[in-house]
Amino acid sequence: QPSVSPGEPSPPSIHPAKSELIVRVGNEIRLLCIDPGFVKWTFEILDETNENKQNEWITEKAEATNTGKYTCTNKHGLSSSIYVFVRDPAKLFLVDRSLYGKEDNDTLVRCPLTDPEVTSYSLKGCQGKPLPKDLRFVPDPKAGITIKSVKRAYHRLCLHCSADQEGKSVLSDKFILKVRPAFKAVPVVSVSKASYLLREGEEFTVTCTIKDVSSSVYSTWKRENSQTKLQEKYNSWHHGDFNYERQATLTISSARVNDSGVFMCYANNTFGSANVTTTLEVVDKGFINIFPMINTTVFVNDGENVDLIVEYEAFPKPEHQQWIYMNRTFTDKWEDYPKSENESNIRYVSELHLTRLKGTEGGTYTFLVSNSDVNASIAFNVYVNTKPEILTYDRLVNGMLQCVAAGFPEPTIDWYFCPGTEQRCSASVLPVDVQTLNASGPPFGKLVVQSSIDSSAFKHNGTVECKAYNDVGKTSAYFNFAFKGNNKEQIHPHTLFTP
């Protein structure tokens, strides 16, 4: 019993003056608490307690369940204890099967002994199975057996407390250990789609999947820069013991333009947090935006190919697309496809393939596209570059020499005189008159130019060259002159192509 110096309050004394007492089942337990300021006896076993306000605790016929710690407390709050074992050959263990372990922590298998003199107090696996090799335990006859540093692998482990009594191994009722995992990583979060585009009034629904080792993981949908509580629904599954999945679905039944923004799915556990975002854009109505991938004014050489390419954004998805030329719709030579296979894709590509274009195929090519809300179109002006062609070259009755050439871009006509038999016509002759004949006609196709010179200026035999040229090429026509007396005669004109 404890002793203290005079004047100070002292703990109560217990009779019998022992720290432990062994009583046979059926015998009497008689404990006396000696203290002028006696308050109560407390009996404690398996974390359950009973109280008694009498200073003498008497149990006439002791049972195994009377095994435990008896504490006497006085008015100063000072106490003394005695531990009583009620030896019962038929009930060696007091058992509380509540057995929960937290990963990496210790846990107590509550199977205190009723007889402290038995041997080999330990744990055994059920049905003779061995315990895990790394399972370490510490026995304490008054409390039970502590499993040290519980592992996740011990979850649902079936075990017994065991002790040898008079040479025989005795087992307690079975215990099933339930292990709660420790969080050793942040939750894994993913979202059904990274972005959503909706029209006003449509339903917005997005699902966040949270994966962790247990259902204790916390998760919520948040609107960035807002404290408003969002309505979410949950579904969850346990795929085995430490593989938990939750789906948190956020729904806005009728989205408005001001619902647009970034929504975050946030999850955390005791290890840390993780989040993933999705972007919602709500538009008041659908749209189509077309972006030409080449200049809308196109120049192409005669006989060459050209691809007219557009990219366009369409929401909702496009329903009709067509390419038109001269009020005629192309049935082939074009293709239309989504820019990506992503399900949130709103960008598309349309290509019209024009091959071996002729000079007569210049003009406006129009791409039209529509969806349920809007129509849109874009026009390409295609100009076919052609080298000049000399349509007519004549000597008119008034003595003028006239050359008419067609081509695109607009040809330039130059005149040259070659005296005598010289092959090179270098002396240029200024035209008297130059006209563009179809400048006010249709905007595409060849431009026709007429140029005239006065032949009376020529006094010698020779050749007159009319040369029409543009960026693409050049063509020439020739007039031969011979003087017979005072008469000037035009010999057969002929053309000579000069590349």
Epitope: L46, D47, E48, T49, N50, D96, R97, S98, L99, Y100, K102, N105, L108, R110, R156, F175, I176, K178, R180, S214, S215, S216, W237, H238, Y244
Partner: antibody, heavy 116, light 107 residues
Amino acid sequence: QVQLKESGPGLVQPSQTLSLTCTVSGFSLTSYLVHWVRQPPGKTLEWVGLMWNDGDTSYNSALKSRLSISRDTSKSQVFLKMHSLQAEDTATYYCARESNLGFTYWGHGTLVTVSS
Amino acid sequence: DIQMTQSPASLSASLEEIVTITCKASQGIDDDLSWYQQKPGKSPQLLIYDVTRLADGVPSRFSGSRSGTQYSLKISRPQVADSGIYYCLQSYSTPYTFGAGTKLELK
């Protein structure tokens, strides 16, 4: 002997916060699990949440955003706090002790009415 | 979350019958299933834990069994005192979930 007793206000205004206390005796909160279970009048039992022996908590998925469970081991008390109460939260609220044998001990329950 | 589908919702039985109440779990819950009886105005009382084991003081006419994810509570030769509502509870993983209850009336 093991006992659990719920206490708290009988009447709570809509949108207000409910605070309940479960006072236990005869056992230690560090050794056992204490659950909250509720039962609307004439309806089924609904598991609300749990205070683990090591102080961790677990909650009903549908209620977790407005629920908080805590404890004071020195006073042997477990607390339930639920905010933004509505009429459908009207119920008898029970606390119960669990061992591996199931919910072996229950309190008598306390009726909470949500009404203005 | 794990759903517990309990049936029937109610039944009326005579004292000579064998009453069977079932609960089906939406996924595996091992043996972590218990049964409770509740009488009007009273707290629920534990009847059976670990699927088959009788709680202290529960008469042997009550028994529990399991087939896969289907769990059954049987009352053979029920007595008038057995009237009440019976619930199953899964404690395999949090959040724990109760069945919707079966109201037993005795003729």
